[in-house]
Amino acid sequence: AFGISGVQKYTRALHDSSITGISPITEYLASLSTYNDQSITFALEDESYEIYVEDLKKDEKKDKVLLSYYESQHPSNESGDGVDGKMLMVTLSPTKDFWLHANNKEHSVELHKCEKPLPDQAFFVLHNMHSNCVSFECKTDPGVFIGVKDNHLALIKVDSSENLCTENILFKLSET
C-alpha cells in the first residue's frame, strides 16, 4: 500500500494529463447505484437538476446516465518515451446537454448545462478498487472522489490507499 504520500504521488500528474482526441473511445448507458444498492436519481426542480441518492420502490425505473469514456495520456515519470501510460476518464450525462461537474470549492457534485468541449470539471478518472465497482476521481483535484454523504453526492478527499476501498466512494454500473 502507498500511504498518504503514495496517493498524492500517483494522482499528482493528473493535472498534466491530456485527453487524446475530442471524441470518446466508447459510450455506455447505465444506471448508477451506490455500493449499498441505493440509486442515483436526477430530478428537475426550478429549472435546475438535483441529484439524489435514494432507495427506489419495487419496479420503479432507474435513471440512466450516459458514460463517455476518453483516453488520457499520462506524462512519463520513469519511461523514456515521454508517455508512461493511459488513463481512462469519463464524463457522466443523465440528460441531453447536462453533465456532472465537480465543484471543488463547495466539495459538491452538480449538474451543469454546457457545450462541448467540456470543462475539466466534467472529467473523472475511472478507478476499479473492487471487482464490480468503480470510483470517480476528479481530474481537477487529484485524490478527491465522487462519494455519498447525507443522501447526496459530494466530493470526498481520499488521503490514503486504504481509503480507496471505502464504500461511500464505490459505485455500481448496471444496464438494468
Epitope: G6, D84, M87, N128, L164
Partner: antibody, heavy 122, light 107 residues
Framework: EVQLVQSGAEVKKPGASVKVSCKAS????????MTWVRQAPGQGLEWMGS????????YYPDSVKGRVTMTRDTSTSTVYMELSSLRSEDTAVYYC???????????????WGQGTLVTVSS | EIVLTQSPATLSLSPGERATLSCLAS??????LAWYQQKPGQAPRLLIY???RLQDGIPARFSGSGSGTDFTLTISSLEPEDFAVYYC?????????FGGGTKVEIK
C-alpha cells in the same frame, strides 16, 4: 519498454504448492492492476485472478478459489501467484499480464509475460 | 458468469481472403470486449479492445465491431502471419471470461 519477466518452469508433485513470480519494468507498477491467466496444453485461456493496483484487493474464479493467492511487492515491482494443493489438471502455462489503463481493468491485457510452465506429475 | 461462445471453431481460408470471427455472449454487457491473437509457443497478443479500438502497433486490416451480446473480429485481407488462434475476452463482469477460440488455418 514494458517488460514482464516470469520465473522459470516448475515440476511439482500432486498436493504440493507452486509460487510463480513476475517482475515488471518500464512502467509505473503501482498504477496497474495485474492479472494471471493460464493455458493447459492444447486448451484455451482461463482467468486465474487479478490483484488491484494498490494490492488491497484480490479476485479469483470459483474454480481455484481457496487454492490461489496473489500478492504484489511494490519495492521490487513483482507480482506473485501461489497455487496450492496442486493436481494434474493444474498443468499449464501461467501468464502474468498488465492492464491497459491506470487504476482499472477496462480494455484487455496489452502486455504479457513469457509464460511459466508448471507441470504437476507424480 | 458470462459465457463467450466463439464461432466457427475453425476457419479455413486462403491468404488475401476476408476472415469474419464471431463471439456471442450469454448475456449483454458494456463493450469491454477484447480480441487476442495467439501463435503456437507464444503469449497472446492484444489486437482489439473496447470492442472496436485497435491496439497500438496492430495493422489496420484488423477491426472489431458489435455490442451487447454479439461481437465480431474482421481481418479484411489475410496475410500469411495472420494464421493463428483468436480469442475474445470480456472484462465487464467478474469472473473475467475468454471464448473457446477460433483457429484460422490455411486452406
Amino acid at each position: 519498454e514494458v517488460q514482464l519477466v516470469q520465473s522459470g518452469a516448475e515440476v511439482k508433485k500432486p498436493g504440493a504448492s507452486v509460487k510463480v513470480s513476475c517482475k515488471a519494468s518500464g512502467f509505473t507498477f503501482n498504477n496497474y492492476w495485474m492479472t494471471w491467466v493460464r493455458q493447459a496444453p492444447g486448451q484455451g485461456l482461463e482467468w486465474m485472478g487479478s490483484i488491484t493496483y494498490t494490492g488491497g484487493g484480490t479476485y479469483y474464479p470459483d474454480s481455484v478459489k481457496g487454492r490461489v493467492t496473489m500478492t504484489r511487492d511494490t519495492s521490487t515491482s513483482t507480482v506473485y501467484m501461489e497455487l496450492s494443493s496442486l493436481r494434474s489438471e493444474d498443468t499449464a502455462v501461467y501468464y502474468c499480464t498488465r492492464a491497459n489503463y491506470y487504476y482499472n481493468t477496462y480494455g484487455g491485457f496489452p502486455y504479457w509475460g513469457q509464460g511459466t510452465l508448471v507441470t504437476v506429475s507424480s | 458468469e458470462i459465457v463467450l461462445t466463439q464461432s466457427p471453431a475453425t476457419l479455413s481460408l486462403s491468404p488475401g481472403e476476408r476472415a469474419t470471427l464471431s463471439c456471442l455472449a450469454s448475456e449483454g454487457f458494456s463493450n469491454d470486449l477484447a480480441w487476442y491473437q495467439q501463435k503456437p509457443g507464444q503469449a497472446p497478443r492484444l489486437l482489439i479492445y473496447a470492442a472496436s479500438r485497435l491496439q497500438d502497433g496492430i495493422p489496420a486490416r484488423f477491426s472489431g465491431s458489435g455490442s451487447g451480446t454479439d461481437f465480431t473480429l474482421t481481418i479484411s485481407s489475410l496475410e500469411p502471419e495472420d494464421f493463428a488462434v483468436y480469442y475474445c475476452q470480456q472484462g465487464s463482469k467478474y469472473p473475467l471470461t475468454f471464448g473457446g477460440g477460433t483457429k484460422v488455418e490455411i486452406k
